[in-house]
């Protein structure tokens, strides 16, 4: 098993399928400039000027506010870009690497988005929502479909629903065939983990959203994070708990729009 | 052609306050962030505030904060910047220009009005 | 906020000469961006997104630079380079310029 710090940042959807086009509305991409504006990241619109994805997507060195744009939802990447400025990056001050944790971060739009029936925001979980195993979860993005294999032109945006997994059985699984003492955690509390040996985030799905229907209302429970390679014999995906970071995320983003 | 015409500079006593104005023309003036931009006589190019194209989001240098309000009136492709508690070091050609939607240099540039600020 | 601090404040050179202007940044920036005015003149975009050159400047100007370091080349100095060059940050607000470089002909 790779060793500590061998760990990857999520990347694509690993058995999956194009997600519906009417499903997902407030999945976004986030594009760093280049040659073209290319995809690195996902994210999720929790407000209409408010954007959610992963630290590592951006910090610990953030970039230039003219190095990034965001898009939102589009079935196919590249396809009809709308590309929106970002006025202010926010990582979370104790964010320093994803299996650290805090790996959480905010992205603020010049202008809010008008939104409609394809493009609104999701969202977030009051505080005493755990996400037990069992529950109806999804994830999303336009990253990896296998470990190191791209996701193929037109580049549409896929879904995988993946099982949730209790933190003390995920950490466990992490401890096998892995270099770190039984009692050092792995899957800390500020985390979640999804996902198996046939469904599970990838490289390129970094910050995108981790969603569950609770009650009839998607909920985002979690922030595509880090795991170690994708879809790996227990090795599932772990995802920043949003839960854990609404004081933080509330700080900054009115609770209603 | 592509233009920034700015005005209202003039003399103003200290503590006093101006409202300067910046007519676009030649571009589809909502579509575009923009921004002041100050130079003292003698001295170096100083960033005062920055608006949004649909004026969301603004920002202002720290010297300039809570004295200095920018805003904007899209249909009628003006930029303006309210200026009170003026002091001397206030003293300023005043500059407004236009932020590129691709690359965000400062592409476009006015020819600047004048504000001393003197008793 | 990010200091930029450009050196040297002023310098001359002689026609044919090369001359570098840096800009050094208080923190990293993604790009570092250059502007030149002349004496009663509004300042002009000369480069953008570290190396890429504004509509119109002569192709004897480069840009170069990462991180904390960047700096303004002129291969091969004309007379009319003569002028103040800024550079300018836009990592994050608050936006400020470097006090500029006085490029004098010798």
């Known amino acids: 098993a790779p060793a500590p710090g061998q760990a990857l940042q999520r990347v694509g959807i690993v058995g999956g399928q194009e997600a519906p086009r009417s499903k997902w509305p407030w999945q976004v991409s986030l594009r760093v400039h280049g040659p073209y504006w290319m995809h690195f990241c996902g994210g999720s619109l929790i407000h209409p000027q408010w954007v959610l994805t992963a630290a590592h997507c951006v910090g610990p060195d953030v970039k230039d506010l003219a190095a990034l744009r965001v898009q939102l939802r589009e079935q196919h990447l590249y396809y009809q870009d709308q590309l929106l400025p970002v006025s202010r990056i926010i990582v979370h001050p104790q964010f320093y690497t994803a299996q650290i944790g805090a790996d959480i971060a905010l992205l603020e739009l010049e202008e809010p988005v008008n939104v409609s029936s394809h493009v609104h925001t999701v969202t977030l979980p009051p505080a005493s929502e755990t996400f037990p195993p069992g529950m109806p979860c999804w994830v999303t993005g336009w990253g990896d479909v296998d470990n190191d294999e791209r996701l193929p032109p037109p580049f549409p945006l896929k879904q995988v629903k993946v099982p949730i997994m209790e933190n003390h059985i995920c950490d466990a699984k992490y401890h096998l065939g892995a270099y770190t003492g039984d009692d050092v955690r792995i899957v800390r509390d500020d985390m979640l983990c999804a996902g198996n040996t046939r469904r599970d985030s990838c490289q390129g799905d970094s910050g995108g959203p981790l969603v569950c229907k609770v009650n009839g209302t998607w909920l985002q429970a979690g922030v595509v994070s880090w795991g170690e390679g994708c879809a790996q014999p227990n090795r599932p995906g772990i995802y920043t708990r949003v839960t854990y970071y609404l004081d933080w995320i509330h700080h900054y983003v009115p609770k209603k729009p | 052609e592509v233009k920034l015409v700015e005005s209202g500079g003039g003399s103003v006593q200290p503590g006093g306050s101006r409202k300067l104005s910046c007519a676009a023309s030649g571009f589809t003036f909502s579509d575009y962030g923009m921004v002041w931009v100050r130079q003292a006589p003698g001295k170096g190019l100083e960033w005062v505030a920055f608006i949004s194209s649909g004026s969301s989001t603004v920002y202002y240098a720290d010297t300039m904060k809570g004295r200095f309000t920018i805003s904007r009136d899209n249909p009628k492709n003006t930029l303006f910047l309210q200026m009170s508690s003026l002091r001397s070091e206030d003293t300023a050609m005043y500059y407004c220009?236009?932020?590129?939607?691709?690359?965000?240099?400062?592409?476009?540039w006015g020819t600047g009005t004048t504000v001393t600020v003197s008793s | 906020q990010i200091v930029l601090t450009q050196s040297p404040a002023i310098m001359s050179a002689s026609p044919g000469e090369k001359v570098t202007i840096s800009c050094s940044a208080s923190s990293s920036v993604t790009y570092m961006y250059w502007y030149q005015q002349k004496p009663g003149s509004s300042p002009k975009p000369w480069i953008y997104?570290?190396?890429d050159l504004a509509s119109g400047v002569p192709a004897r100007f480069s840009g170069s630079g990462s991180g904390t370091s960047y700096s303004l080349t002129i291969s091969s100095m004309e007379a009319e380079d003569a002028a103040t060059y800024y550079c300018q940050h836009y990592h994050s607000y608050p936006l400020t310029f470097g006090a500029g470089t006085k490029l004098e002909l010798k």
């Open positions: 220009a236009r932020r590129d939607n691709y690359d965000w240099y400062f592409d476009v």
């Open positions: 997104r570290t190396s």
